[in-house]
Interface confidence: low
């Protein structure tokens, strides 16, 4: 008799794929068009990479560092109207978009939550999210809670509002803490909340590190569900060398928990790469005219059209991940098993009950490996078989789909294999 | 292994069509772009264009456009070249080459000869 | 378009012997440039990508460098078999443009 299917968990759609960052509209639009009514002319894209979410903003009034020039009720006139904004709301559902808004208060200032007045933002903040959830968004974000105080309290009552309104409703908190400690204390009064850190931003040295980084992370979070990215706002160049992006997008896209990601990520946008462009809101990358400064700086393998056109860029892995992360039972929900490869490597499986399974190897190192996978650190059903399918490779010249032995498995320096194999009984 | 195994030479008239193939073996053909490069007789490289593999949408170097096609068979693994009224000055050895960003043109065809001459 | 001037267009050098060939960049194009192989039978190899980086199968006495907007492929000891053509290829922008070529023939 066959046995019996796992009971599939409640899947919220946050679950389902990755979230996708937009927290400079101007920056992300370009040549000054930087508007709500322009990024709905910009949705096409975002529904191509098969994100399910998009974090905007803010884009509310503030009057740097000033409480009473500060609305979180009213659009900064610069970015549009609330027609605008209703409109965009409407096109990004018929695109199966949702739409996250930041309501980090003092965007413009020196402390994000005006710390001297904190009650008086609190009770802004509490406004803001029920006059925008009647307004039809489908969550909220806001950031440096570490300068919060109380932070963990006011993020309670905040995520009862939000989830008083629709379970189907997410609250994001973001803090520049790498600590784990201060990490958990923020989660451990709060269920449902998602929290994007700086946990794994100095995770780029070794297989090792990252490996027990995440396996620390999740051990200590147990069963609830987490975000992965690295840091709460900033782009993935700022901690990582263009070499180890495909390897972190590939991470990124298969561990447990949603992936988080800023606007350029997806085609390894640097800021370091475009003089006079700040670090933390470079230009978007759209073709070689989005950045007319310096001519010649831009080159087409650096924009989106560009690397559109090419199905080897970092841009068209960004789109298969995104895909088979949104699809892959045991990538949107699977039981996740770290194991030992050999120095310098990351690896584990996902798995959910008899369907397809995934296996990723990791190589942060700058040198080729042969990975020992050692199957002896996982539990038998997760089980590791002889030979797996390679779904891809984070560098080209592998043939996909050809099945790999796992016992003589070599990797090239920086990269990072996904393979598949079916269950077996 | 990966190879480009690219057709046979070819003698033609001006004003006839030729078609050059190139079969990709080693790799799926839809993970990489297929480049086209032209080496006139006793002269350099030159870069024709490309075909996107994955949405079969071709690009044209400004020299290029107009005579020449890029198609692509992708159940047969196969990007195809085709000029159409042919010129004595399109004598020359065609070459493919597979491309990604970074590894752009990696692996190359052998070449096919192609001379025009009445 | 991106120009690359190569240079020198043919030399004539010694088994054993150390050689360099350059390519100049008319633009900034990042390091994004390769080095090809052609031999007198006509087929071509790519030796290099990303300025310095070695293809697999490539002998080590192949080397890549960059210095500015002048790239170098250097052989430090020739052996018969690398007689032939070289060509640079920068593949920062469209289009793809390729150097003038380099002859190195047996003294």
């Known amino acids: 008799r066959a046995p019996r299917c796992r009971e599939l968990p409640a899947q919220k759609w946050w679950h389902t794929g990755a979230l996708y960052r937009i927290g400079d509209l101007q920056a992300f639009q370009g040549h000054g068009a930087g508007n709500l009514a322009g990024l709905k002319g910009r949705l096409d894209y975002l529904s191509s990479l098969k994100v399910k979410g998009l974090v905007l903003g803010p884009i509310h009034k503030n009057q740097k560092d000033d409480v009473a020039q500060t609305d979180l009720l009213q659009i900064d006139p610069n970015f549009g109207s609330k027609e605008d904004f209703d409109s965009l709301l409407q096109s990004a559902k018929k695109k199966s978009i949702r739409v996250i808004l930041d309501l980090t208060p003092n965007y413009r200032g020196e402390n994000s939550w005006f710390s001297t007045q904190v009650d008086t933002v609190a009770t802004k903040v509490k406004d803001a999210l029920e006059f925008w959830l009647q307004a039809g968004v489908d969550g909220f974000q806001v950031r440096d809670i570490e300068n919060l105080k109380d932070a963990s309290s006011f993020l309670a009552e905040w995520q009862n509002i939000t989830k008083g309104f629709s379970e189907d409703r997410l609250l994001i908190a973001g803090t520049n803490s790498s600590d784990l400690q201060q990490i958990l204390s923020l989660l451990e009064s709060n269920k449902d909340l998602l929290l994007t850190s700086s946990y794994l931003s100095d995770s780029g040295s070794t297989g090792e590190h990252t490996k027990s980084l995440v396996t620390q992370y999740l051990n200590a979070t147990g069963n609830r569900w987490c975000s992965w990215s690295l840091s709460q706002a900033r782009l993935l160049t700022s901690f990582l060398p263009a070499q180890l992006l495909r390897l972190y997008q590939l991470m990124l896209f298969t561990l447990p928990g949603t992936p988080v990601f800023s606007y350029g990520d997806e085609i390894g946008l640097d800021a370091a790469a475009l003089p006079g462009q700040p670090m933390e809101a470079p230009v978007m990358l759209w073709d070689e005219s989005s950045f007319p400064d310096i001519p010649g700086a831009v080159s087409a393998n650096m924009t989106v059209k560009g690397q559109s056109e090419d199905p080897g860029s970092l841009l068209s892995l960004f789109r298969r991940l995104s895909d088979q992360r949104s699809k892959e039972r045991s990538l949107l929900h699977g039981d996740f098993h770290a194991f030992s490869a050999g120095p310098g490597l990351f690896s584990y499986i996902r798995h959910w009950d008899q369907n397809e399974r995934f296996l990723v190897v990791l190589n942060f190192g700058d040198v080729g490996l042969s990975a020992g996978l050692q199957a002896s650190d996982l539990p038998a059903s997760a089980s590791l078989p002889a030979k797996a399918d390679l779904l891809l490779s984070t560098q080209p010249g592998r043939e996909e789909g050809s099945p790999l032995e796992l016992e003589r498995l070599k990797l090239e320096p920086h990269e990072g294999l996904l393979l598949r194999f079916p269950y077996a009984a | 292994q990966i190879q480009l195994v690219q057709s046979g030479p070819e003698l033609k008239k001006p004003g006839e069509t030729v078609k050059i193939s190139c079969k990709a073996s080693?790799?799926?053909?839809?993970?990489?772009?297929m480049n086209w490069v032209k080496q006139a007789p006793g002269k350099g490289l030159k870069w024709m264009g490309w075909v996107n593999t994955y949405t079969g949408e071709p690009t044209y170097a400004d020299d290029f456009k107009g005579r020449f096609a890029f198609s692509l068979e992708t159940s047969a693994s196969t990007a195809s070249l085709q000029i159409n009224n042919l010129k004595n000055e399109d004598t020359a050895t065609y070459f493919c080459t597979r491309s990604v960003i970074t590894y752009t043109m990696d692996y190359w065809g052998q070449g096919t000869s192609v001379t025009v001459s009445s | 378009d991106i120009q690359l001037t190569q240079s020198p267009s043919s030399l004539s050098a010694s088994l054993g012997e150390r050689v360099s060939l350059t390519c100049r960049a008319s633009?900034?194009?990042?390091?994004?440039l390769s080095w090809l192989q052609q031999k007198p039978d006509g087929t071509i190899k790519r030796l290099i990508y990303?300025?310095?980086t070695l293809d697999s199968g490539v002998p080590k006495r192949f080397s890549g460098s960059r210095s500015g907007s002048d790239y170098s492929l250097t052989i430090s000891s020739l052996e018969s078999e690398d007689f032939a053509d070289y060509y640079c290829l920068q593949y920062a922008s469209y289009p793809r443009t390729f150097g003038g070529g380099t002859k190195v023939e047996i003294k």
């Open positions: 080693g790799y799926s053909i839809t993970n990489f772009g």
């Open positions: 633009q900034e194009i990042s390091g994004y």
């Open positions: 990303a300025a310095s």
